[in-house]
Amino acid sequence: GITSINCSGDMWVEPGEIFQMGMNVSIYCQEALKHCRPRNLYFYKNGFKEEFDITRINRTTARIWYKGFSEPHAYMHCTAECPGHFQETLICGKDISSGHPPDAPSNLTCVIYEYSGNMTCTWNTGKPTYIDTKYIVHVKSLETEEEQQYLASSYVKISTDSLQGSRKYLVWVQAVNSLGMENSQQLHVHLDDIVIPSASIISRAETTNDTVPKTIVYWKSKTMIEKVFCEMRYKTTTNQTWSVKEFDANFTYVQQSEFYLEPDSKYVFQVRCQETGKRNWQPWSSPFVHQTSQETGKRNWQPWSSPFVHQTSQTVSQVTAKSSHEPQKMEMLSATIFRGHPASGNHQDIG
């Protein structure tokens, strides 16, 4: 940029050095050179000489006009052609920027990750503004009426120590830049309702050598929340479609979940949990890959259809990953999946 240029004259921009993208812009150059009556005044944008829409206003001043200026940033400078000088003489330079006023922040969400000591609020910023844009997060207690403000660029973490006075808050976000300001919708937050349990981790899996082999997946969390509802999704690595099982979990001990799976196949498992009856889910855990053992019998294997499994139709979802390399990105499909339970034996995956 041209921030510390020694000017021998002046350069100014109408409507201003930062303006709305797509506006018509006039840039003026006025020389104040000693011992020079310029033959010509020249404009340069990002180092390249401009040829068109230049008007000489008087002996000392010229203007360049841009229709619908749409570059986020440009470095403008102007020069004079002085008689008897081989090179052009620099007059002045300016950084100019164009951008957009901010969109109203949308999809404002606030959560407390268990043990983090923070309330984390995120939002969608909307279309790019191309200029410095800040977000002012307002947090107002519905009990004491006290309001706090936090400055953010894309998200904010607010220490729960500063939220001691009350449990219920109103949260909203203002997007501000030099071209405008917009407010998000207000979000009602009860601190007890936005806690996401400590991360759930799949620690290991094993496939038994029974006549009908079963895979047991072991998973755990350090959460102190008593009532936790979880989903485990799984699929073969060659498949795009996930199957999902639901569980009510009690993490005072390691969870064990049983699956009747295709033999000699590589499966990927992921788990996520939420406090029972609440809205916010953990992100899916890291993918855990397990290879089921080879089939020993000759019987035609039909998962979910063996005499050893009860068929119970559940309202659960089937999801399709966009790409096998991106297991976190998926689109929901409307489907019913059959959730299998072994006919006998101790199991903890009823839910």
Partner: nanobody, 116 residues
């Protein structure tokens, strides 16, 4: 911890001018995004003007063309020049220092009263 002290408020007739000052101490306010805010009785505190790292300045629609934000880095001071004042500009005016991720720090405020 930065401390902010506003001054320059007072009573003025509609159409008059005032210049508010805000002096920062405690540490250089260069790490702050500085803003002027105001709160009228029974209303929420609202942002009046804020300066950005690219040198640009935001002005609320209600003050555009009448108020000017300026700063004097050597004195750790920011100013709000208020011209063509209107009765609806009557409020307590605060300057604020905001750093990313931190709670905004306010001064004690200075009262501006505009009578018609």
């Amino acid at each position: 911890q930065v401390q902010l002290q506003e001054s320059g408020g007072g009573s003025v007739q509609a159409g008059g001018s005032l210049r508010l000052s805000c002096a920062a101490s405690g540490y250089t306010y260069s790490s702050c995004t500085m803003g002027w805010y105001r709160q009228a009785p029974g209303k929420e505190r609202e942002l009046v003007s804020m300066v950005f790292s690219d040198g640009s300045t935001f002005y609320a629609d209600s003050v555009k063309g009448r108020f000017t934000f300026s700063q004097e880095n050597a004195k750790n001071t920011v100013y709000l020049q208020m011209n063509s004042l209107k009765p609806e500009d009557t409020a307590m005016y605060y300057c604020g220092c905001a750093t990313l991720g931190s709670r905004t720090i306010w001064g004690q405020g200075t009262q501006v009263t505009v009578s018609s």
